[in-house]
């Protein structure tokens, strides 16, 4: 009679993480008698996957029933397979023997490997905000999946980016793997509404990439430009000076008026206008009673933007020699010049 | 669903032979391995041995050869453990347990006193 | 014949405590046939850990399972009053198969 032998049929089977692996195996005698086991792996560090008469493996279960007479398929099936599960495994006869039983004959062995999907790709900007013209960098992280093949684009704005470093971990075999990806983008005043996207494609998503977004909003901080002008006078006495302050992001502001370098008022940005670009517009005034002064007057508009040092500009108002004598009643004649900076 | 029923409380005197059963029911008595387990009062558990159903064969562990004999009956489904010569070290709670090892029969106590 | 050591024989632990128990075995133990069982008096023994990490059907996520070779251990992240019990491990690497002589654990 023929010396039994154990038939796996296939090489290697591809599973998706989540489904079930059936693992064929078949013998060609009944004797000797014996049990059958499964393992993963060979040699002294193999696991055991299935035994057909002792221990507990709760995700296996039996293609055929075992204890019916003549049978020979010792197939299984293992349920929601994870990356954890890749490996080869082998169909093992053994003999029965005293004190263990004997391992008679092992199958070639099935290389059960497992496609998993990677995790949604996590985009992460900079700590902290940076002004147009600067290079903010960009990273991307995805988990989990297998096999080692992906492939990671950079786009912002639809348009692809070039600037960009990526790595899969571990360079090794693995049962999953991660990929980490850092790109450069350099920063233009338009940015408050871009946005950048990283996409993943892999085997497992079946040409429907994963994509991971981040706003350049949270990146960018654009400061404001200032611009103090006389306006029209309301009375003979008084002067009324405007803070233009322009196209900055984000929102948070304060605004300070000094008048020749003493604080006379403090307000926070409130009711602003917001620009096609998405950038803010606001502007604050300042009633003079040019009456109070006998000398001209340095009117000044601090900003602090953003938690950033202050930006401010200053103007002078010329209380003229006529006004200066007669007081308000010449509050008209009173001009308002432009000084550098302070 | 899967039980194991064992026999009931048996006090026996010393010398004597018992024979404890366990009745499997909701799963094939041959696809598994049978274990008897021992379990003295208030102290740990002590495996005796296995039976194969399908074919008899049958391990035991040094301590119980020659004291402990284990059979099987597929007919009845049912699994026995038979004990010799019994004296009061004899006295404890006897287990059968599945070989997949996560059911176990609610256990028979023996007693040996005279 | 592989020894089974358990310790401690007996310990105590406060509500919310970590609990670490260990298994020595005399010889090297596969970790796929290295199995724990829990016990509460007047009850069959409940299978618990099975192949040194996987946890049986019903257990808490705070019980877990680890070790290799000769040294293997069961830990509760943080001890329930209702894991007041005896812990068993267990050897089917090879013939005669072996309990550990338990770790009665109480409440405090």
């Known amino acids: 009679e023929d010396e039994l032998q154990v038939i796996q049929p296939e090489k290697s089977v591809s599973v998706a993480a989540g489904e079930s692996a059936t693992l064929r195996c078949a013998m060609t005698s009944l004797i000797p008698v014996g049990p059958i086991m499964w393992f993963r792996g060979a040699g002294a560090g193999r696991e055991l996957i299935y035994n057909q008469k002792e221990g507990h493996f709760p995700r296996v279960t039996t293609v055929s029933e075992l204890t019916k007479r003549n049978n020979l398929d010792f197939s299984i099936s293992i349920s929601n397979i994870t990356p954890a599960d890749a490996g080869t495994y082998y169909c093992v006869k053994f003999r029965k023997g005293s004190p263990d039983d004997v391992e008679f004959k092992s199958g070639a062995g099935t290389e059960l490997s497992v496609r998993a999907k990677p995790s949604a790709p996590v985009v992460s900007g900079p700590a902290v905000r940076a002004t147009p013209e600067h290079t903010v960098s960009f990273t991307c992280e995805s988990h989990g999946f297998s096999p080692r093949d992906i492939t990671l684009k950079w786009f912002k704005n639809g348009n692809e980016l070039s600037d960009f470093q990526t790595n899969v971990d571990p360079a090794g075999d693995s049962v999953s793997y991660s990929i980490h990806s850092t790109a450069r983008v350099v920063l233009t005043r338009g940015d408050v509404h871009s946005q950048v996207i990283c996409e993943i494609a892999h085997i497992t998503l079946q040409g429907d990439p994963l994509r991971g977004t981040a706003n350049l909003s949270e990146a960018i901080r654009v400061p404001p430009t200032l611009e103090v002008t006389q306006q029209p006078m309301r009375a003979e006495n008084q002067a009324n000076v405007t803070c233009q302050v322009s196209n900055f992001y984000p929102r948070g502001l304060q605004l300070t008026w000094l008048e020749n370098g003493n604080v006379s008022r403090t307000e926070t940005a409130s009711t602003l206008i917001e620009n096609k670009d998405g950038t803010y517009n606001w502007m604050s005034w300042l009633l003079v009673n040019t009456c109070a002064h006998r000398d001209d007057v340095v009117l000044t508009c601090q900003v602090e933007h953003d938690g950033q040092q202050a930006v401010s500009k200053s103007y002078a108002l010329e209380i003229s020699a006529h006004q200066k004598e007669h007081g308000s009643d010449i509050t008209h004649e009173a001009a308002l010049a432009p000084t550098a900076p302070l | 669903e899967v039980q194991l029923q064992q026999s009931g409380v048996e006090v026996v005197q010393p010398g004597a032979s018992v024979k404890l059963s366990c009745t499997a029911s909701?799963?094939?008595?041959?696809?598994?391995?049978m274990h008897w387990v021992k379990q003295r009062t208030e102290q740990g558990l002590e495996w005796i041995g296995r039976i194969d159903p399908e074919d008899g064969e049958s391990k035991y562990a040094p301590k119980f050869q020659g004291k402990a004999t284990m059979t099987a009956d597929t007919s009845s489904s049912t699994a026995y453990l038979q004990l010799s010569s019994l004296t009061s070290d004899d006295t404890a709670v006897y287990y059968c347990v599945r070989g997949s090892y996560e059911y176990w029969g609610q256990g028979t106590t023996l007693t040996v006193s005279s | 014949q592989i020894v089974l050591t358990q310790s401690p024989a007996i310990m105590s632990a406060s509500p919310g405590e970590k609990v670490t128990l260990t298994c020595s075995a005399s010889?090297?133990?596969?970790?796929?046939?290295l199995y724990w069982y829990q016990q509460k008096p007047g009850s069959s023994p409940k299978l618990w850990i099975y192949?040194?990490?996987n946890l049986a059907s019903g257990v808490p996520p705070r019980f877990s399972g680890s070790g290799s070779g000769t040294s293997y251990s069961l830990t509760i992240s943080s001890m329930q009053a209702e894991d007041a019990a005896s812990y068993f491990c267990?050897?089917?690497?090879?013939?005669?198969?072996?309990f550990g002589g338990g770790t009665k654990l109480e409440i405090k």
């Open positions: 909701g799963f094939n008595i041959e696809a598994y391995y």
């Open positions: 267990y050897q089917w690497s090879s013939y005669p198969y072996t």
């Open positions: 192949s040194t990490s």
């Open positions: 010889s090297s133990v596969s970790s796929s046939y």
